[in-house]
């Protein structure tokens, strides 16, 4: 690509970068820990580990004060907060998609197990359309490992 | 952001300047360079997004810079070459596309 | 391009700088203007002020706003501040090259 293509690119990434997409991540992981539950399993189990925030001193976050309630008390709330900030990408669908990766690689870590990948997977790609939002058509969710050295 | 230190270069030559970002996720978010002469206004040279792997340079710098990063420690870097007088100036890193956290600056001296 | 080059206001009062941008910076997608206000102060490194135009960084007073649409942008200080003497300087980034205004000096009248 020409080097000013990119622009359209860079206008995404400067939303990417103000958005505050924790929220999400939280729904999703408690919506998917009370599926665990109706069948049994314990998300809180001592083999698991809580959800702790990602240690970015910029990125303070107002919504979390402790660890996913596995009630879902706030799940709602959390929910509401996600499309808020979700909207914001709602007219490029591209962006939606980066959106959606970013989500996807800050949660990876904190997933045990390809079942639960799977399954955070599927409830991701359905969150714009709980939103009342245009889902992008096509949008790979792998995780990649890290970025692109360049020396 | 933590930039190297300051250099002493004769003209023809070529400085590299290096810029450790801690904090936060590297690859999250783009770098760009800016530099400024003594008494001067701001002069933004380009970008580089980490994740990527994409590069964007101003065309006045076009062939003689080139904007690189090691991700595995949080690190990019801006090298000049054919180094003349008027590049003398405090090179600063700045994260995010609208550059919200800025490095220390590192001052380049051009000499003979 | 910024207007004026220098500015001198009294303490307490209003302070408004320009910033004419050659194309416009509105993304119809989102409806953000990719253009930014920073701070200089004398020795130091620059500080963002603004982002989309009219959002304030965090940590940022409340005396500081932007407006502004299409092409032409304002920075106000409603009531300076003696640490408010700074160069500010206006950047666009909605396409590359992001080229920032030549400079404002505010000083104290």
């Known amino acids: 690509r020409q080097q000013w293509e990119l622009q359209g690119d860079r206008r995404c990434q400067s939303q990417l970068e103000r958005a505050n997409l924790r929220p999400c991540e939280q729904h999703l992981m408690q919506k998917i820990q009370r599926d665990e539950d109706s069948y049994g399993r314990d998300p809180y189990s001592p083999s698991q580990d809580p959800y702790s925030p990602s240690q970015d001193p910029d990125r303070r976050d107002p919504y979390s004060p402790s660890p996913y309630d596995r009630r879902g008390a706030g799940s709602s709330q959390h929910q509401e907060r996600c499309c808020n900030e979700l909207n914001e990408f709602e007219n490029n669908q591209r962006c939606m998609c980066e959106a959606l990766q970013q989500i996807m690689e800050n949660q990876s870590d904190r997933l045990q197990g390809r079942q639960q990948e799977q399954q955070f997977k599927r409830e991701l790609r359905n969150l714009p359309q709980q939103c009342g939002l245009r889902a992008p058509q096509r949008c790979d969710l792998e995780v990649e490992s890290g970025g692109r050295d360049r020396y | 952001l933590v930039q190297s230190g300051a250099e002493v270069k004769k003209p023809g030559a070529s400085v590299k300047v290096s810029c450790k970002a801690s904090g936060y996720t590297f690859t999250r978010y783009d770098i760009n360079w800016v530099r400024q002469a003594t008494g001067q206004g701001l002069e933004w040279m380009g970008w580089?997004?980490?994740?990527?792997?994409?590069?964007g340079y101003a065309q006045k710098f076009h062939g003689r810079v080139i904007m690189s990063w090691n991700t595995s420690i949080s690190t990019a870097y801006m090298e000049l070459s054919s180094l003349r007088s008027e590049d003398t100036a405090v090179y600063y890193c700045?994260?995010?596309?609208?550059?919200?956290?800025w490095g220390q600056g590192t001052t380049v001296t051009v000499s003979s | 391009t910024q207007s004026p080059d220098s500015l001198a206001v009294s303490l307490g009062e209003r302070a408004t700088i320009n910033c004419k941008s050659s194309q416009s910076v509105l993304d119809s997608s989102n409806n953000k203007k990719f253009l930014a206000w920073f701070q200089q102060k004398p020795g130091q490194r620059p500080k963002l002020l603004i982002y989309w135009a009219s959002t304030r960084e965090s940590g940022v007073p409340d005396r500081f706003t932007g407006s502004g649409s299409g092409t032409d942008f304002t920075l106000t200080i409603s009531s300076l501040q003696a640490e408010d003497v700074a160069v500010y300087y206006c950047q666009q980034y909605y396409s590359p090259p992001h080229t920032f205004g030549q400079g404002t000096k505010l000083e104290i009248k």
């Open positions: 700045t994260r995010g596309v609208d550059s919200g956290v």
């Open positions: 580089m997004n980490p994740k990527s792997g994409e590069t």
